[in-house]
């Protein structure tokens, strides 16, 4: 056993190359210099080491860097990254987006592992916020990233980062998440002109309040029915027939096909049948003529 700990004569590795795949685990431990390994980490990925051999290489790096690996090593970990534990990763200080991309590439196409989740957490905390470039990178690898975050986590996304969000990144977000993202998008896109603004804000409108929908109705935006159906019911209900007509423009005809579905159904119930008739779509279920409409919520607020 004692002899095995010493490197056999002529076996000392002058560099990291393919010949090392024939080394037994104890030979790798004894014959590969940890500092050499650290400087030539980029070569490891090209060599078909077994999992057991990778364990040895990781052990050597752990001994060399007990406080955590430097970024120069982390960037070239490649498949060795899969051997890291969240505890290992918590010791790292990753600041380069290139390093993050290199490690995400290793896990590409697979569900996010605890290691990747820890890496992202460390990276974002190190940057202080989820900035535009980071968000761009994360959504490229993980299209559902934003919609997997809690509203609390989303609240820390700065408005400037919203420019990195593509419509498909929001496809599976729920209303509570959009409630958080919408005000940020509104702020981010506030200096754009009417039609350009609408194109950008459209995917976020599931979080829009009534007053913003009223404002949009004055801008000839021609909202499509798919977007309208994703609006908050409580935001749609106070809109008048005229406002909905202006908001939807030529798409207003689509209301007929959706008259039994929320939010259209609930909105119809709040409108006077006379007003609905002016659309000429045959929408039924409005408040009959001559009925008095009491706004109970207003009454409660006053009492």
């Amino acid at each position: 056993e004692v002899e095995k700990t010493a490197c056999p004569s002529g076996k000392k590795a002058p560099e990291i190359d393919e010949s090392l795949i024939f080394y037994k685990k104890w030979e790798l431990e004894a014959c590969v210099d940890a500092a050499l390994l650290a400087t030539q980490m980029d070569r490891v990925n090209a060599i078909p080491f077994t999992y057991e051999q990778l364990d040895v290489l990781k052990h050597k790096l752990d001994e060399l860097y007990p406080q955590g690996y430097p970024e120069s090593v982390i960037q070239h970990l490649g498949y060795l990254f899969l051997k890291m534990s969240p505890e290992d990763i918590r010791k790292w200080n990753v600041t380069s987006l290139e390093t993050l991309k290199a490690l995400l590439e290793v896990n590409k196409g697979h569900e996010m592992s605890p290691q990747v989740a820890t890496l992202i957490d460390r990276f974002v905390k190190g940057r202080g916020q989820l900035d535009k470039d980071t968000l761009d990178t994360l959504t490229a690898f993980y299209p559902g990233y934003l919609c997997s975050l809690s509203p609390e986590e989303l609240s820390s996304v700065p408005p400037s980062s919203i420019w990195a969000v593509r419509p498909q990144d929001l496809d599976t977000c729920d209303p509570r998440q959009l409630d958080v993202l919408y005000p940020k998008a509104r702020l981010a896109f506030q200096n754009m002109n009417g039609s350009e603004y609408f194109v950008k804000i459209q995917s976020f409108l599931g979080g829009a309040p009534t007053e913003d929908l009223k404002a949009l109705s004055q801008q000839n935006v021609s909202m499509d029915l798919a977007t309208f159906m994703k609006l908050r019911t409580d935001a749609v209900l106070p809109l008048t027939v005229a406002e909905v007509q202006k908001l939807l423009g030529p798409h207003v005809e689509g209301l007929k096909a959706e008259e039994r579905h929320r939010p259209v159904r609930d909105w119809i119930l709040r409108q006077r049948q006379d007003d609905l008739d002016t659309l000429g779509l045959g929408l039924q279920g409005g408040i009959p003529n001559g009925y008095l409409v009491l706004d109970l919520s207003m009454q409660e607020a006053l009492s």
């Epitope: 569900e111 996010m112 592992s113 990747v116 989740a117 559902g144 809690s150 599976t172």
Partner: nanobody, 116 residues
Framework: EVQVVESGGGLVQPGGSLRLSCGVS????????MRWYRQTPGNQREWVAS????????GYADSVKGRFIISRDSAKNMMSLQMNSLKSEDTAVYYC?????????WGQGTQVTVSS
């Protein structure tokens, strides 16, 4: 392969309670948000409630707020929806939805019927 399975649906009288469960098997490893949606015939799916990956914070549709409670057991990859004070308009097929950073997974649904 990730599988999502709902259970617990059934027939209940107005004002009654029911508890739905959702089990997830497969390699859902980190950062997943779990949601309940429901769908009535001819209608689009409607969001009911969510429980988020970090800290277990929750969100509810206005129509169920104060009546339904969503909870999860991350260790067992389970989620449940406690439905109280049920109304006839809660009748629907209830679907469990698991959102990961990479994908969205749906169950086959469980029927809830509220009727006297």
């Amino acid at each position: 392969e990730v599988q999502v399975v709902e259970s617990g649906g059934g027939l209940v009288q107005p004002g009654g309670s029911l508890r739905l469960s959702c089990g997830v098997s497969g390699s859902i490893l980190a950062l997943n948000t779990m949601r309940w949606y429901r769908q009535t015939p001819g209608n689009q799916r409607e969001w009911v409630a969510s429980i988020y990956s970090s800290g277990g914070s929750t969100g509810y549709a206005d129509s169920v707020k104060g009546r339904f409670i969503i909870s999860r057991d991350s260790a067992k990859n389970m989620m449940s929806l406690q439905m109280n004070s049920l109304k006839s308009e809660d009748t629907a097929v209830y679907y469990c939805n698991v959102q990961t950073p990479l994908n969205v997974y749906w169950g086959q649904g469980t029927q809830v019927t509220v009727s006297s």
